[in-house]
Each structure stands twice: as C-alpha cells, then as structure tokens.
C-alpha cells in the first residue's frame, strides 16, 4: 500500500455506508470502492501526477524552504460517479445511476 | 498564519523566481504572490471549503478509522494567472499576459 514514503497514487478504500451513517438513506450497495489518494508529492513531480504550475512552484519553494512551505498534496483530480439505490422523500426506493463525485478516478499533486 | 490546527484557508506565499531557478527565463516580475493553501480539513467540512462528495466521505471514514484513512487535504481549487516578461527563442523580451495556474484563487478540501 502507498505510505508517506511512496509517490502519490490511487489506493483502495472500501467504504461501508453503515460505518459513515449513510445506510439510513442509501439502500444499496452496502459498500463501494471509493479509492483514496495516498503518497507524497516529491521533487521532481512526474507527469502522471498532472501537476499544476502552482504545484510545481510550491514544490520548488518547499525544496528551498522546507520548514516554511509545505509540499503539494496528493488529492483526487478526477472523480467518478457510482449508482445507488436510495429512499426518496416519500420512502420510495429510487435508483440514481450517476451519483457524482463518489469515487476517485485519478490522483494528482495540487 | 494558518497552521495545522487552523481550518483550510488561503495564506500568503511570496515566491522569488531566483529562489526556484526560474530567473533564467522569467525576466520580470522578480517575485509574485503565489499564495498557499494551509490548514486542516476537519469534520464537519464547511461550505467555504467546497467539499466534493468524496472529500465528505473520506472525512467521515477518517472520523471512524483515523489511523487507517487520512483526512481530506487543503489544496488550491481555483488558480489565477499572472503576467510575466520572458525571453523568447530569439532572446526577445516578450510579455505573456496570462501565464495560467500560477496563483491560488481559492482553496478547498479534496
């Protein structure tokens, strides 16, 4: 698994809706693959972490002044939807095919 | 200034192009305000950090399993351009009015 010493990458994160209290309105699935972005944004930032110019600048400043400025952070840069079965206001089970922004598609340094 | 204990916010970060080795091609300005996103993404995530659904989910999972899953990260969510004077291939000083993605406009939890 990607620890603090590894480079920014997408790792598995299985989320159980009961654990986060969302089982009260999400009927199914019981859990899903959310993924998590883990690892460091180390110099030099590789193309695969699609760094912004600001992230590149911050990385260079951190290199020069590590105690003053933090590294860029490994975060989701693109998200994917999941499909969920939920109860609407009337308690009717309803399928939402595209519940947006729930799962990581790509990670990057920002 | 925003430390680890404070909430995610935009803070000042003056960047000197000489410090990062970009003075070899950027003639002016000598330095600029890049800003930095600093602070924590604590539960509950406020509207002003414009959290994605994934960031909300990750925050809730972190609350339940703090050693297993990290918090969402405070990063630039919107960037602004700056204007720079640089030398082209012929050595001609040229103004780029919109050198995109160089300065933080907004921070958020991702």
């Amino acid at each position: 698994s990607a620890g603090a010493g590894s480079h920014c990458q997408k790792t598995s994160l299985r989320v159980n809706f009961e654990d986060i209290g969302w089982d009260s309105w999400i009927i199914a699935p019981k859990e899903y693959e959310a993924y998590e972005c883990k690892g460091g944004c180390f110099f030099p930032l590789a193309d695969d972490v699609t760094p912004t110019k600001h992230a590149i600048v911050q990385t260079l400043v951190h290199l020069k002044f590590p105690t003053k400025v933090g590294k860029a952070c490994c975060v989701p840069t693109k998200l994917s939807p999941i499909s969920v079965l939920y109860k609407d206001d009337m308690g009717v089970p309803t399928l939402k095919y595209h519940y947006e922004g729930m799962s990581v598609a790509e990670c990057g340094c920002r | 200034s925003a430390g680890a204990g404070s909430h995610c916010q935009k803070t000042s970060l003056r960047v000197n192009f000489e410090d990062i080795g970009w003075d070899s091609w950027i003639i002016a300005p000598k330095e600029y305000e890049a800003y930095e996103c600093k602070g924590g993404c604590f539960f509950p995530l406020a509207d002003d950090v414009t959290p994605t659904k994934h960031a909300i989910v990750q925050t809730l999972v972190h609350l339940k399993f703090p050693t297993k899953v990290g918090k969402a990260c405070c990063v630039p969510t919107k960037l602004s351009p700056i204007s720079v004077l640089y030398k082209d291939d012929m050595g001609v000083p040229t103004l780029k009015y919109h050198y995109e993605g160089m300065s933080v406009a907004e921070c958020g939890c991702r």
Partner: antibody, heavy 119, light 111 residues
Framework: EVQLVESGGGLVQPGGSLRLSCAAS????????MNWVRQAPGKGLEWVAH??????????HYAESVRGRFTISRDDSKNSLYLQMNSLKTEDTAIYYC??????????WGQGTLVTVSS | DIVMTQSPDSLAVSLGERATINCRAS??????????MNWFQQKPGQPPKLLIY???NQGSGVPDRFSGSGSGTDFTLTISSLQAEDVAVYFC?????????FGQGTKLEIK
C-alpha cells in the same frame, strides 16, 4: 543574422502618396509584431504604427498624427511589411524605420528610408 | 498618452567618468510587477539599438558599464565609466500603453 531592409522612400509633394516596404530575414517574421517608427531630421523618435500577428487577426494601431492617412500591412508569406502613406504633409518628412519585436519592445531595427515631403 | 521627459537634454562627461541620464513618465509605467521601460542608444547615422529593457535588464551584447534602475515614474540610465564609443543620443521609451512613446532624447558628448 536579423536583417530589416526598408525601401520606397523618396521625394513627394504635399498631398501625394508613397508606399514603403520592409524585407525581413534571419527570424521567423510571422512570430513578431512589426512597427514603423519615424525620426524627423535632427529630432526624436516617434512610433507611427504597428501590426500584430495572424493569431491577433493582424490587429493594427496608429499614432494619432497619421490615423486615417497611413495604412500598415504585412505579408507573412513574403516576410514583408508595408506602409501605405496617403495625403502626405510636410511634417511627415522623416527617416522611417521598420522595426520588429514583441508586445513589449522594439527588438530589431532596419537602417531606415528617408521620406521627404516638399513642394 | 504617456509623456516621457528626459533630463538633461545634453550631457558632457569626461572619459572614464560616470554619466547619468534621467527619464520621468507622466504616469506610472509599471504593471503586474513589471516596468514597461526601455532605453535605446542611437549613434550618428545609425538606427537605435536596444540597450536596457524592463528598467534594469541589459540588451544582448550590451557592455556591463550600462545599467538601468527605477520604477513607477522615475528611471535612470547609468554609464559607469564613459568610453569614446558611447557618444550617442539616448532615448527612454515606454511600452505600457499604445501609443508607445519616447523621451525627447539626451545627447551624450565627451568633455
């Protein structure tokens, strides 16, 4: 080596017309703003007009003193710059320099061509 | 239009001595942290040559004795040790706004 060579200058009567040309070499002509700058005998420098790039739709700007009388144009395929001067006045008498550069500076200069407006 | 005013109009300096030419703009020529100020040298019978750009940066092939300083409305061109080949007319020029305008020129001679 960058070269700008002006031609077309000469003696013309007030109210007359003249067309100046500038042949460029040694740089990618189409990448640079082009200008005309003039200098009356023994006097200072005066920017006359500029023409931008194809990506700017060849936008042009003129000094107030020549607007409506002078027209700047370029032919990137021929690496050439032109200045069509109509309704010439005695105060237009000057050396006309073709200059190339960026949106920031006059980087390249020709040797100039003399335009004399006199009756 | 931005008016550029140079001082003095003419200057006589001994060889090896320092020469200083000033230029004042009718309004600030700074924007985005950049000074839109250039200096040109014109020797007799020649076209102008870019000497200093962005207030303080030397043009290509310009000797180190030439330096520029200033910001906003007030700028200075300095020749640290005058050489015979520096006899010329010097012009300041702003490129912040169209029309790009020049100072009236300063004629530099040897005393």
């Amino acid at each position: 080596e960058v070269q700008l060579v002006e031609s077309g200058g000469g003696l013309v009567q007030p109210g007359g017309s003249l067309r100046l040309s500038c042949a460029a070499s040694g740089f990618t002509f189409s990448n640079y703003w082009m200008n005309w700058v003039r200098q009356a005998p023994g006097k200072g420098l005066e920017w006359v007009a500029h023409i931008r790039l194809k990506s700017d739709n060849y936008a042009t700007h003129y000094a107030e003193s020549v607007r409506g009388r002078f027209t700047i144009s370029r032919d990137d395929s021929k690496n050439s710059l032109y200045l069509q001067m109509n309704s010439l006045k005695t105060e237009d008498t000057a050396i006309y320099y073709c200059t190339g550069g960026s949106n920031y500076v006059f980087a390249f200069w020709g040797q100039g061509t003399l335009v004399t407006v006199s009756s | 239009d931005i008016v550029m005013t140079q001082s003095p109009d003419s200057l006589a300096v001994s060889l090896g001595e320092r020469a200083t030419i000033n230029c004042r703009a009718s309004e600030s020529v700074d924007n985005y942290g950049i000074s839109f100020m250039n200096w040109f040298q014109q020797k007799p019978g020649q076209p102008p040559k870019l000497l200093i750009y962005a207030a303080s940066n030397q043009g290509s092939g310009v000797p180190d004795r030439f330096s520029g300083s200033g910001s906003g409305t007030d700028f200075t061109l300095t020749i640290s040790s005058l050489q015979a080949e520096d006899v010329a007319v010097y012009f300041c020029q702003q490129s912040k706004e169209v029309p790009w305008t020049f100072g009236q020129g300063t004629k530099l001679e040897i005393k």
